[in-house]
Amino acid sequence: EINGSANYEMFIFHNGGVQILCKYPDIVQQFKMQLLKGGQILCDLTKTKGSGNTVSIKSLKFCHSQLSNNSVSFFLYNLDRSHANYYFCNLSIFDPPPFKVTLTGGYLHIYESQLCCQLK
């Protein structure tokens, strides 16, 4: 297992919510991405391929998410101060083998200006 801080901007704020960006290498074809808050699994997304190169996307812990060819974005809405925490992208790579797990993360700071429904 490889652990480390994200070397990219992991948190993108908009409209009282946050997009948490979890990147993976372009070469990865089949994987599971979990978003962890502390040690708790908040969201997950698994991408696998069929014999005809059809793709299956599954979530056991569903969050609004967006998949690209090198990242999964998880969206958290209605931010409040309780969202401030360490968040981790837990990537399990199935294909290409061999199986490996990488963990990258960062701290989500919540500032007044980022909170939902602020009275201006």
């Epitope: 599971k32 696998t48 069929g50 005809g52 199935f94 294909d95 290409p96």
Partner: antibody, heavy 121, light 106 residues
Framework: EVQLVESGGGLVKPGGSLRLSCAAS????????MHWVRQAPGKGLEWVGV??????????YYSDLVKGRFTISRDDSKNTLYLQMNSLKTEDTAVYYC????????????WGQGTLVTVSS | DIQMTQSPSSLSASVGDRVTITCQAS??????LSWYQQKPGKAPKLLIY???LLAEGVPSRFSGSGSGTDFTFTISSLQPEDIATYYC????????FGPGTKVDIK
């Protein structure tokens, strides 16, 4: 212990039909892509076709040599794979193997011992 | 459809010899190539997958290399129990086997 046991082989006339079965045990059958592979006497291995898992809507794919004549199906509740062979030709004579493969999260590959199909008049 | 060719079709070598088999795909298959061993009257056995990864329980004298269209399978020191036919198989797009290489002892 993983086991794949093929049955249903035998002698059939050209133009006839036969249904092969493959009973699986010792692994989670529903998670595996299931293939049929055949081997004519004294020849090499030839892929026949595959049926994917429920996640992929049990999609089936076939080699050009059998497309339109052979049909693969599966019954996950019975851990059984089937090969329905119609319009059989003498060149379909072979040992038919069922094989199970998975790539997620680790790569596994299991084979049965095969069942002989002879197409002859 | 992806075609696979293999060479040689047969070879004889002495115990302890290094044996090399080559496999060529008709188009780029990345590293989605397996090698199988088949002994007479038996089902094939997976030795190597994803070009160079050893299947569970396979001795380290077996190895594989290559990428794209050209691949190599090597037995570093041939043993009597290695007498068999060896097949490459692409799994980039469905499955296709090579024609096989029969290996025996001199």
């Amino acid at each position: 212990e993983v086991q794949l046991v093929e049955s249903g082989g035998g002698l059939v006339k050209p133009g006839g039909s036969l249904r092969l079965s493959c009973a699986a045990s010792g692994f989670t059958f529903s998670d595996y892509f299931m293939h049929w592979v055949r081997q004519a006497p004294g020849k090499g291995l030839e892929w026949v076709g595959v049926i994917d898992t429920k996640s992929f809507n049990y999609a089936t794919y076939y080699s050009d040599l059998v497309k339109g004549r052979f049909t693969i199906s599966r019954d996950d509740s019975k851990n059984t794979l089937y090969l329905q062979m119609n319009s059989l030709k003498t060149e379909d004579t072979a040992v038919y193997y069922c094989t199970a493969t998975i790539a997620v999260p680790y790569y596994f590959d299991y084979w049965g011992q095969g069942t002989l199909v002879t197409v002859s008049s | 459809d992806i075609q696979m060719t293999q060479s040689p079709s047969s070879l004889s070598a002495s115990v302890g010899d290094r044996v090399t088999i080559t496999c060529q795909a008709s188009q780029d298959i990345s590293n989605y190539l397996s090698w199988y061993q088949q002994k007479p009257g038996k089902a094939p056995k997976l030795l190597i997958y994803y070009t160079n990864l050893l299947a569970e329980g396979v001795p380290s004298r077996f190895s594989g290399s290559g990428s794209g269209t050209d691949f190599t399978f090597t037995i570093s020191s041939l043993q009597p129990e290695d007498i068999a036919t060896y097949y490459c198989q692409q799994y980039y797009n469905y499955r296709t086997f090579g024609p096989g290489t029969k290996v025996d002892i001199k």
